[in-house]
Every structure is written in C-alpha cells, then in structure tokens.
C-alpha cells in the first residue's frame, strides 16, 4: 500500500519536518525557521506555538514537534496541553473574578488550584466527626456508634490501664 | 509580482569572508519574514539565517552560528548575509527566500531566484 501511495502521490515521500513543495515539482522542502511539520506527506508546515507572557516554554519547538508551554510560578496550567494558564491560591481559598477568597465555613480546599469544596457529612455513613474540619482540610470521621460496640475494633486509644488495688467508681 | 536577485557569490578559501546580497521586489522585506536557505551538492535544501516577526528575532543554523550574520536595508529593499571563518561544507547554491503564511495557519516559503554559486576551496 505505502509503494502504492508514494507512486501515486510523490509528497507521500516527504519525511516530518519537510513540507512537499508544489512550486517545486513536488520536492520536499524543510520547514521555515519557527514551524514544523511533525506528520511526512504535508503540503505546508505548521506555526510553532509561542510561549509568551504567563507562559513559558517547557519544551522547544522543532522542525519535526510543536512547542510545549506551562506556566510561569504562582500559576498553573488549564486545558488540553495548557492551552490557558490560571493563577493559583493558597490552600484554604479559591479564584473568583475578584481574585482569591477564603474557603466559606463548612468548606475547604487543600490545593493551590480548584474550588473550595463541602467537609464531609459523617453522619450520612453513621459516623461521628473525629477531627474537625478547617479551610485547608477535610473534616475526619470517627467510628460509628456501631463500631464501638464490645468486641468491635475501634480505631479510639485504648483506656490507661488502672493502678492495682484501685476500683473503678 | 515578487522577485529575488542575489548576487555576492564565488570562489573563497576556507577561514575567508564573502557578503551575498538579494534585491528583492514585489514586496518589501521590512515587512516580511526574509532569509536564506542553501543547497550544497547531492544535499536538500537548509534553512541557514532568517529574520522573523518583522525584525524581532533572528534564526541562525547551528552549523553557522557565530560566523555568519544577516541584516537588511530597508531603503534598497535588499537582504544580506555576511559569512566568515568559511569553511569546506558552506559550499552551496544560496537561495533568498520569503516566508509564506498561509490562512488557514500552515507556513511555507518562496525562493524564486537562481540562487548564487559559494564555493569555499584552498
């Protein structure tokens, strides 16, 4: 099939980094300095991408592959191959048009990026909260009531063991 | 219609200096993406110098960086490229050339001129 197609297409021939050049009798011509070409067989190259402002270049452009950007410290990437770069927060905030604002009670956020999200309910899996929750952290739920029946395991410190001689009240 | 001229070409031993020149018309190279690319015998054609976003930036070969430099007039409408500490493997038909940008985003270039003979030999 590929012989096939390169007899009856001649730019089927021209390797990544080239583009097949129609005013040339179809030769394969490399491509302009800042694009590339990254399939053979194209009939132009393509633009490199350019790394400006927020972002910055993580990976250069070459003749046979695109550039590749990230972000610039204090934001982070968005998008399929950080095609937009959003500022981050500390954690216990989140971004809102008017910038970063802190996490409202019953709500947290443990990374730079994101929206703030609720604590966990424990008393929809029957729980008790063992630790409380903060902006920065998600409540932790405690054993359920069940939990702590005899016999059952419990994830509570066992109680100090008694002096000899004392009984209980 | 846009035409390329250069001229500047010739016979030069290795270590020596030569300076191609290209009057260029039907466009203006002010506002265009202009270099060079050669052809040296049996090889494909390669990009050697451009000047990119309208004088912004430079492209140089790694090959050439350091002893070769293209510059403009803009008054005479002409492309240059100064070579020097010349060696064997510059041999080549050099081409002035201009970047195509096409609309629906793909890049190619012309080079419609013959080119110009460098032949660096002891």
């Known amino acids: 099939f590929e012989r096939t197609r390169s007899l009856q297409d001649p730019c089927s021939n021209c390797p990544a980094g080239t583009f097949c050049d129609n005013n040339r009798n179809q030769i394969c011509s490399p491509c302009p300095p800042n694009s590339f070409s990254s399939a053979g067989g194209q009939r132009t190259c393509d633009i490199c991408r350019q790394c400006k402002g927020v972002f910055r270049t993580r990976k250069e452009c070459s003749s046979t592959s695109n550039a590749e950007c990230d972000c610039t410290p204090g934001f982070h990437c968005l998008g399929a191959g950080c095609s937009m770069c959003e500022q981050d927060c500390k954690q216990g905030q989140e971004l809102t048009k008017k910038g970063c604002k802190d996490c409202c009670f019953g709500t947290f956020n443990d990374q730079k990026r994101g929206i703030c999200r609720p604590w966990t309910n424990c008393s929809l899996d029957g729980k008790s909260v063992l630790v409380n929750g903060t902006k920065e952290r998600d409540v932790v739920c405690g054993p359920s009531p069940a939990d702590l029946s005899p016999g059952a395991s419990s994830v509570t410190p066992p109680a100090p063991a008694r002096e000899p001689g004392h009984s209980p009240q | 219609e846009v035409q390329l001229l250069e001229s500047g070409g010739g016979l030069v031993q290795p270590g020596g200096s030569l300076r191609l020149s290209c009057a260029a018309s039907g466009f203006t190279v002010s506002a265009e993406d202009v270099g060079w690319v050669r052809q040296a015998p049996g090889k494909g054609l390669e990009w050697v110098s451009a000047i990119l976003d309208r004088g912004g930036s430079t492209y140089y070969a790694e090959s050439v960086k350091g002893r070769f430099t293209i510059s403009r007039d803009n008054a005479k409408n002409t492309l240059y490229l100064q070579m020097s500490s010349l060696r064997a493997e510059d041999t080549a038909v050099y081409y002035c050339?201009?970047?195509?940008?096409?609309?629906?985003?793909?890049?190619?270039?012309?080079?419609r001129g013959q080119g110009t003979q460098v032949t660096v030999s002891s």
């Open positions: 050339a201009r970047v195509v940008y096409h609309a629906g985003g793909g890049v190619t270039y012309d080079y």
